[in-house]
Each structure stands twice: as structure tokens, then as C-alpha cells.
Amino acid sequence: MAVTACQGLGFVVSLIGIAGIIAATCMDQWSTQDLYNNPVTAVFNYQGLWRSCVRESSGFTECRGYFTLLGLPAMLQAVRALMIVGIVLGAIGLLVSIFALKCIRIGSMEDSAKANMTLTSGIMFIVSGLCAIAGVSVFANMLVTNFWMSTANMYTGMGGMVQTVQTRYTFGAALFVGWVAGGLTLIGGVMMCIACRGLAPEETNYKAVSYHASGHSVAYKPGGFKASTGFGSNTKNKKIYDGGARTEDEVQSYPSKHDYV
């Protein structure tokens, strides 16, 4: 029950996070004009990853897209790439996690397969969240650098007479949406990975206890396997039913997935 809840919550948190990453990527307010001490401005500039906008105090807003690809700063291109990679990974992760949900029954899918899918989606969410956080942080760093550069030459004197006020930009709402969304996706991914461990629990390996009967030697082995006789009627330890238990060989093939989450 706790595993299902953890998995379900992880899915929902990641879903909200990815929706937030998509929203942040599409938002125009990645950087907004710094208003200094003046909260009311006649012309307000703000920029996104795809276009820049100007809102006038008349109520008119005009946005124009960045119709060049080569002319854009490399950092902006990198941020775009990180956000898109985050969205793509997140979307794939969501798709995978839907099929991995314990509450959803698809054919005769084994719990081990669901555990694998849960882990895969969890890792995808973690990487997606990290991509978003990295993208937003790179943009924020770019803003901080430009802010102090423009502050240094805030007023560039032209002939000592005319002043040209340089527009400074500060953090826009999209950055905060991106950070929060990235964090949520990351948390959702971690929850999925935790749920994966519960879906495929580690076996407690007890030593096989042999009981010597007068006629036959019967070894009882726990873990959902039928006892095998000493005469080799079930020497391969074939599964009689699937209750999420595995042979010792199977357990050994999984350590990296469960021990290094």
C-alpha cells in the first residue's frame, strides 16, 4: 500500500513539475526590466527564451520573436536546449511511469518489469528536473553578470551632455517557476526510485534447511519455489507462481538498480 502511494505521489509530483517546466519554457518573463526605485514605468520590457516583449502604460503589449538562430547568444541556445531536453525526458518518463503504476494493470506484466519501468521513469524525472534547474540557473547567472555590467556603465555620457539610460534586467517569474518545477520533478523522480525498491523487495536469503527422511532427501527453500527433491525432479528451481520472488541468481543480477539509487 505504501509503495503504491509513494509511486502514485511520485507520479503526480513529477507531472506537476513537468507541467511547470513546460510553462516556464513557454513563459515570456524570464528576465524583466529592473525598475530600480520606480515601481511605475511607462515602458516595461521583458524577455523570454523565444521572444521579447514591451508593455506600455497605455495597455498595449508588443512581442517579437527571435527570428534568428545563429545570431542568438550561445548561452540562450544552451538554456533552450536544456529546457527542451528536460521536457522531452520528462514526457517520456511520464509515459513510462503510467505503465509502471501499480494501480494500473496491463496484461500479465510482472512486478519486476513494473519495478524496472518505475526506476527508469524515476531516473528520467531526476535528469529532467536537473536539466530544468541547470537551464534556469545558467540563465539566472547570465542575468546577474549582465546586471552588474550594465550597472557599471548605467549612464554612458555622450559628449558630457546627453544621458542614455541603459535598461537593466532582473529575474523574471519564469525563473522561479522553473526552479520550483525542476525541484518538484526531481523530488518526484526520487520518490519513483524509492517506490521501485518496494515494488521489487530484496529477498532475505535463509540457508536451505535439509530434512533427511528415510527414503528421500528433501530440501525446503523459501521464496515461493516448490521444494525440490534430492532426485532432481525440480533441480532448476522453476517458478511455480510469481509473487515477486526470485531465485538467488536473479537477485544477483539486480544490484546496481537497487543499491545505487
Epitope: V40, A42, S57, S58
Partner: antibody
Framework: EVQLVESGGGLVQPGGSLRLSCAVS?????MNWVRQAPGKGLEWVAW????????TYADDFKGRFTISRDDSKNTLYLQMNSLRAEDTAVYYC???????????WGQGTLVTVSS | DIQMTQSPSSLSASVGDRVTITCKSS????????????LTWYQQKPGKAPKLLIY???TLRSGVPSRFSGSGSGTDYTLTISSLQPEDFATYYC?????????FGQGTKVEIK
């Protein structure tokens, strides 16, 4: 079609108060008051966002003048306190348009501050 | 505050003349966000309210005759009347529309020669 009609002007004594009104019809996102002293140039007084109520004033009028609006009556106001002789002017209300230009103006209302 | 200086303060011209009025601002009115200059031109006749002619330094308001044109960027702007008509004799004002407080030039009176 936008129509702006000012009212409330008249003779007032120095130190007195007056409230100007501007009846607005048509779409107005933000409005302004601009004045013109006799034989002088145009002087911007104040701006208001008709939806949010956000406002700003020219330095000479901060503290003395208050711009406001009444949504229900679709009316713009300019409350003028501590009036001085130099406040004598024709007061216009004007709509702010694209490019922060003033595209529609009222006919103006004359305010005379004299003892 | 941005100061607006118009020149000349008055001028005499004849019908059909080409008239140029200049306006200088103490700060650049060019907005980097949309590469537009926030300068506006108005015409005012005696006893009447001002009338909008040009916004964004060079965009003609609909209904305004094409003989009016605006140009300039940064701090220097020009209003040109290509062929003066009898109805054009009036006072012309430039306005800073870039930042509050909005400020007007002192005006240029165009009189009949």
C-alpha cells in the same frame, strides 16, 4: 468611438479645493490629466490605469493632486487641494494610446485660482 | 526627468513651404526592447484641444495627412510638413512618451508669412 467630457472647473480661492470630472465612453485602459496655463505650453499632470488603479504624478503635483476613477460611473477624477494662483489653467483629460501617445482629448475645463 | 527642447519657438512660412521642427531630449527615448523611439508629436489650434499627429517618432496616426512625417532616434527628432497647407498653421508640441513624468517641449508656433 471614445468620448471624453470634462466638468467641475470654475473659480476657486487660493488654498481651496476642486474636483474635476471626466465622463468616459468607449475603451480606455489608462487615462491622463494634462493642463495648459493661459498662453503657455502643455504640462502633464497625472496618469492612472483604469483597471488596476495604479497611478503616477508629475513631481509638482505629488501630495496636492489625486487622480482616481469610478468604475461604476466610468468617470475619471482629479482632486485638487491647496490650489495656488499658478494652478490656473485649462485642464484636459486624455486617453493614453499606442506608443504612450494621447490620442483622444476632452474639450477642457478652465480652473481659475484667484482671490 | 527628461527635458524636451524644441526649436525654433516660432517660425513664419507660406502655403506650400516645407517646414521642419526639431525636438531634442535630455535622455535617449529609444527603447531597446522593441527598438522604437517613444516620441510623440501634437498639433494644437487656438482654443482647441491638442491633436495627435505622430507616435513612435515616425508612425503617422490614421487620418493624419501624409504631408506630415516624423524622423529621428535617440535624442534628436524632427517633424516635417512637406507642403504647408492653410489648416496647418498651429502650435506643434513634442512629448517624451518613454518615461514618467511625461514631458512636453515648449511648443513651436507656425505662423503665416
Amino acid at each position: 468611438e471614445v468620448q471624453l467630457v470634462e466638468s467641475g472647473g470654475g473659480l476657486v480661492q487660493p488654498g481651496g479645493s476642486l474636483r474635476l470630472s471626466c465622463a468616459v465612453s468607449g475603451y480606455t485602459f489608462s487615462m491622463n490629466w494634462v493642463r495648459q496655463a493661459p498662453g503657455k505650453g502643455l504640462e502633464w499632470v497625472a496618469w492612472i490605469n483604469m483597471y488596476t488603479g495604479e497611478r503616477t504624478y508629475a513631481d509638482d503635483f505629488k501630495g496636492r493632486f489625486t487622480i482616481s476613477r469610478d468604475d461604476s460611473k466610468n468617470t475619471l477624477y482629479l482632486q485638487m487641494n491647496s490650489l495656488r494662483a499658478e494652478d490656473t489653467a485649462v485642464y484636459y483629460c486624455a486617453r493614453l494610446y499606442r506608443g504612450n501617445s494621447l490620442d483622444y482629448w476632452g474639450q477642457g475645463t478652465l480652473v481659475t485660482v484667484s482671490s | 526627468d527628461i527635458q524636451m527642447t524644441q526649436s525654433p519657438s516660432s517660425l513664419s512660412a507660406s502655403v506650400g513651404d516645407r517646414v521642419t521642427i526639431t525636438c531634442k531630449s535630455s535622455q535617449s527615448l529609444l527603447n531597446s526592447g522593441n527598438i522604437k523611439s517613444y516620441l510623440t508629436w501634437y498639433q494644437q489650434k487656438p482654443g482647441k484641444a491638442p491633436k495627435l499627429l505622430i507616435y513612435w517618432a515616425s508612425t503617422l496616426r490614421s487620418g493624419v495627412p501624409s504631408r506630415f512625417s516624423g524622423s529621428g532616434s535617440g535624442t534628436d527628432y524632427t517633424l516635417t510638413i512637406s507642403s504647408l497647407q492653410p489648416e496647418d498653421f498651429a502650435t506643434y508640441y513634442c512629448q517624451n512618451a518613454y518615461s514618467f513624468p511625461f514631458t512636453f517641449g515648449q511648443g513651436t508656433k507656425v505662423e503665416i508669412k
